[in-house]
Interface confidence: low
């Protein structure tokens, strides 16, 4: 009679993570008597996956009933496959012996490859805000995918970016892989509403890529422009001076009025108006009583935006242009919360 052969018909099997892998194995003879065992890997370090004779293998089931006398099908199913299960599996026939069974013949092996989906890409931006015209870096990470082949693209508002560098680790064989990419983005004043998107395409995603996003509103700082103007005289001795703070982001802003270098009032921007591009405008005004002044007054609007060094704009108020009230040597009373007397 011809000597028993162990046949593993599948050279390779590809399974998606979470699914069940079927590893096929048949023997060509019932002789010699003895159990079958399945191993991952070969040589002394091989890992026992299933032993027909004894042991508990909760993830493994046999395709046919191995207790039947004439059974020659030793195929197994391994449930809930993960990338860690990848490897070459060998179906090995043992001959009954005493005290131990003796290895008789091995199949040629079946390579199990596991397809695992990449994790959702996580995009992170710089730790500190940056201003328009500056270049900032964004990183994108995705993990746990297999096989190694993967495509990563960057977009800003739907436009593909080209300035980025991507690494897939590890370089050698592994159960699963990770991708790490860094993209450089030049900020513009219109970027408050902009989004940076990292898109990952992999064979496991069936053409439906995964995306991670970052809002540039978390990254950009648009510094304000200031304009100080003198409004027409509201009353004979009163001048209204306004400070227009335009096109700034984020909203965090503190304004200080200085009169001849002395702090007059400090305000925090509250009731701002929002522009279409997401930036903000704000106006502060100061009502100045000039009747008590013989000299010109230098009014300064000083703005500290988002914790940055203060910027300022000044306006020289010409006192001589306003007629003095007869007999008046004191400034008039404040007539509103934003009015200011000059002494």
């Amino acid at each position: 009679e011809e000597e028993l052969q162990v046949i593993q018909p599948d050279k390779s099997v590809l399974v998606a993570a979470g699914e069940t892998a079927t590893l096929r194995c048949t023997a060509t003879s019932l002789i010699p008597v003895g159990p079958i065992q399945w191993f991952r890997g070969a040589g002394p370090g091989r890992e026992l996956i299933y032993n027909q004779k004894e042991g508990h293998f909760p993830r493994v089931t046999t395709v046919s009933d191995l207790t039947k006398r004439n059974n020659m099908d030793f195929s197994i199913r391994i449930g809930n496959i993960t990338p860690a299960d990848a490897g070459t599996y060998y179906c090995v026939k043992f001959r009954k012996g005493s005290p131990d069974d003796v290895e008789f013949k091995s199949g040629a092996g079946t390579e199990l490859s596991v397809r695992a989906k990449p994790s959702a890409p996580v995009v992170s931006g710089p730790a500190a805000r940056a201003t328009p015209q500056h270049t900032v870096s964004f990183t994108c990470e995705s993990h746990g995918f297999s096989p190694r082949d993967i495509t990563l693209k960057w977009f800003k508002n739907g436009n593909e970016l080209s300035d980025f560098q991507t690494n897939v680790d590890p370089v050698g064989e592994s159960v699963s892989y990770s991708i790490h990419s860094t993209a450089k983005v030049v900020l513009t004043r219109e970027d408050v509403h902009s989004q940076v998107i990292c898109e990952v395409a992999h064979v496991t995603l069936q053409g439906d890529p995964l995306r991670g996003t970052a809002n540039l509103s978390e990254t950009i700082r648009v510094p304000p422009t200031l304009e100080v103007t003198q409004q027409p005289v509201r009353a004979e001795n009163q001048v209204n001076v306004t400070c227009q703070v335009r096109k700034f982001y984020p909203q965090r802003l503190q304004l200080t009025w200085l009169e001849n270098g002395n702090v007059s009032r400090t305000e925090t921007a509250s009731t701002v108006t929002e522009n279409k591009d997401g930036t903000y405008n704000w106006m502060s005004w100061l009502l100045v009583n000039v009747s008590a002044h013989r000299d010109d007054v230098k009014l300064t609007c000083q703005v500290e935006h988002d914790g940055q060094p203060a910027v300022s704009k000044s306006h020289d108020l010409k006192v001589s242009a306003h007629p003095k009230e007869q007999g008046s040597n004191t400034a008039a009373e404040n007539t509103g919360s934003n009015e200011r007397n000059i002494y």
Epitope: G45, E47, T82, P83, A84, A116, S119, A120, V122, E141, H143, G144, D169, P170, S174, V175, S176, Y177, S178, H180
Partner: nanobody, 127 residues
Framework: HVQLVESGGGLVQVGDSLRLSCAPS????????MAWFRQAPGKEREFVAA????????SYKDSVKGRFTISRDNARNTFYLQMNSLEPQDTGVYYC????????????????????WGQGTPVTVSS
């Protein structure tokens, strides 16, 4: 079977430093992530830090951020936990853990994600 062997624990003073090591042994081992957990006397085991086998951004327990650093040496197949500015509340048994394949969306803070555990190395910070 994989074994994780920790070393480097001991008795130190407040403000001192220690470096714990974790070396996987046994069959050729590859993991998704390695982590350090700790268990203070009479308390539940808690997550300290984790890092992916292939690198990337580590994850830390809030109270150790800036003081502890988890790192790896691929050539030596060893993971480390550098602990600086130690405080009495850092006292406990420190365990190394390995997550063989990814079971969550990120670096697991949940001990149930980890497949292999070391025996633990005690760290005592005295004031």
């Amino acid at each position: 079977h994989v074994q994780l062997v920790e070393s480097g624990g001991g008795l130190v003073q407040v403000g001192d430093s220690l470096r714990l090591s974790c070396a996987p042994s046994g069959r050729t081992f590859r993991a998704y992530a390695m982590a350090w957990f700790r268990q203070a006397p009479g308390k539940e085991r808690e997550f300290v830090a984790a890092i992916r086998w292939i690198g990337g951004t580590p994850s830390y327990k809030d109270s150790v951020k800036g003081r502890f650093t988890i790192s790896r040496d691929n050539a030596r197949n060893t993971f480390y936990l550098q602990m600086n500015s130690l405080e009495p509340q850092d006292t406990g048994v420190y365990y190394c853990a390995a997550e063989e394949t990814q079971k969550g969306s990120g670096l697991g803070h949940d001990g149930r994600h980890y497949d292999y555990w070391g025996q633990g190395t005690p760290v005592t910070v005295s004031s």
